[in-house]
Interface confidence: low
């Protein structure tokens, strides 16, 4: 997946830091105080639809076959710049009681972006 | 995730059968001859952005916090109807060396759709 560098407007991964205080979650998240969540942004022209960096999936490849042939209904389906690879991160937080939990939380960090 | 029923235009999962013959892959895929791949379609108005049925991820929850508060650059980010849960399927196929392989291929079937 591409890293956004300001030179291209093609689907890429943009760096973004989330502060848990900003979103009001510092009452239950002990550590970290924030993290680099990142996000996806950019255009998905038809020639790169279904390309998802190293996470190109079988499904998007198949659908793109139909899309590129103008097969209804795929010809009109918008291809979107979305996370194609997310990774977990370890967090220390209070659970539903007052127990302190250390756990790897899934889908926290965007690693790669691609066109759906 | 919603199943498309023709009554709503909100992001939902649409049934779709893929024929490997249709896309010219029947020369290397032995079995099955096709499968229900499904796909995602529908609108993602701002109030349902970041809702992905049972797969709502930590990341999309966080980003939606910023989006709903009109935080630049998220206010202008398009929310898209995309697969949020895919499952594998077993396939019998020829590899590059004409060996017959039986393997579970990841990300073949769309199980759930949601708004990114």
């Amino acid at each position: 997946g591409l890293e956004c560098d300001g030179k291209v407007n093609i689907c890429c991964k943009k760096q973004f830091f989330v502060s848990f205080k900003d979103i009001g979650w510092n009452d239950w998240i002990i550590a970290p105080s924030g993290y680099h969540a990142n996000y996806c942004e950019g255009e998905c022209p038809s020639h790169i639809a279904g390309t998802s960096g190293s996470s190109l999936s079988f499904h998007s490849t198949v659908i793109n076959h139909y899309r590129m042939r103008g097969h209804s209904p795929f010809a009109n389906l918008k291809s979107c710049c979305v996370p194609t690879k997310l990774r977990p991160m370890s967090m220390l937080y209070y659970d539903d009681g007052q127990n302190i939990i250390k756990k790897d939380i899934q889908n926290m960090i965007v690693e790669e972006c691609g066109c759906s | 995730g919603l199943e498309c029923d023709g009554k709503v235009n909100i992001c939902c999962k649409k049934q779709f059968f893929v024929s490997f013959k249709d896309i010219g892959w029947n020369d290397w895929i032995i079995a099955p001859s096709g499968y229900h791949a499904n796909y995602c379609e529908g609108e993602c108005p701002s109030h349902i952005a970041g809702t992905s049925g049972s797969s709502l991820s930590f990341h999309s929850t966080v980003i939606n916090h910023y989006r709903m508060r009109g935080h630049s650059p998220f206010a202008n980010l398009k929310s898209c109807c995309v697969p949020t849960k895919l499952r594998p399927m077993s396939m019998l196929y020829y590899d590059d060396g004409q060996n017959i392989i039986k393997k579970d291929i990841q990300n073949m079937i769309v199980e759930e759709c949601g708004c990114s």
Partner: antibody
Framework: QVQLVQSGAEVKKPGSSVKVSCKAS????????ISWVRQAPGQGLEWMGY????????NYAQKFQGRVTITADESTSTAYMELSSLRSEDTAVYYC???????????????WGQGTLVTVSS | EIVLTQSPATLSLSPGERATLSCRAS??????LAWYQQKPGQAPRLLIY???NRATGIPARFSGSGSGTDFTLTISSLEPEDFAVYYC??????????FGGGTKVEIK
């Protein structure tokens, strides 16, 4: 101390709609998911859907999809549940409920409203 | 959607006795299961969350166990105030949340 205070009992005609409110006070944050759970007379508990007021994001149980609308007003810390096309089997006590933690890691319903009895009768 | 089946429907016991309530899920919910107590005319009260953790303020006589599809709520020695209806609820990570049909613990 968190308190969820619901609106009063309602009597409605079949085919009409009802809107129940739930006002949160004490240590509130709009990041908490407010759920609506109903209980028909002598029956069990049934989850209808939730809203995260911070987002306006609502998620509904398939059974109620298209008939229930959950909204929230962040400025007044109030959540609303509107159920339309009422029928006699919608006669129930409707509860709002909230976890201890903010979404998505707070999952179970620790705080409950007192319940609102909605009677559907012609 | 995951279906939770509680058994027995009714449990008739005397104060001081041990109560064992069961909740079975139609598919694995890992340890994402809670137990609630409800008395007539009152809202439910959270007793146990994540299968075995007692909620704040819940007496030690209440304990939960199990994972996957089979769960148990145990009340080691019934007090008069424990006679009520008990519900299990699953949250296998995200909604829809579902509840079991309930077990009524009544005085024998």
């Amino acid at each position: 101390q968190v308190q969820l205070v619901q609106s009063g009992a309602e009597v409605k005609k079949p085919g009409s709609s009802v809107k129940v409110s739930c006002k949160a006070s004490g240590g509130t944050s709009s990041s908490y998911a407010i759920s609506w759970v109903r209980q028909a007379p002598g029956q069990g508990l049934e989850w209808m859907g939730y809203i995260i007021p911070a987002f306006g994001t609502a998620n509904y149980a398939q059974k109620f999809q298209g008939r229930v609308t959950i909204t929230a007003d962040e400025s007044t810390s109030t959540a609303y549940m509107e159920l339309s096309s009422l029928r006699s089997e919608d006669t129930a006590v409707y509860y709002c409920a909230r976890p201890v933690r903010t979404y998505p890691l707070g999952k179970y319903f620790y705080h409950w409203g007192q319940g609102t009895l909605v009677t559907v009768s012609s | 959607e995951i279906v939770l089946t509680q058994s027995p429907a009714t449990l008739s016991l005397s104060p001081g006795e041990r109560a064992t309530l069961s909740c079975r899920a139609s598919q694995s919910v890992s340890s994402y299961l809670a137990w609630y107590q409800q008395k007539p005319g009152q809202a439910p009260r959270l007793l146990i969350y994540d299968a075995s953790n007692r909620a704040t303020g819940i007496p030690a006589r209440f304990s939960g166990s199990g994972s996957g599809t089979d769960f148990t709520l145990t009340i080691s020695s019934l007090e008069p105030e424990d006679f009520a209806v008990y519900y299990c609820q699953q949250d296998s990570i995200f909604p829809p949340y579902t509840f079991g049909g309930g077990t009524k613990v009544e005085i024998k």
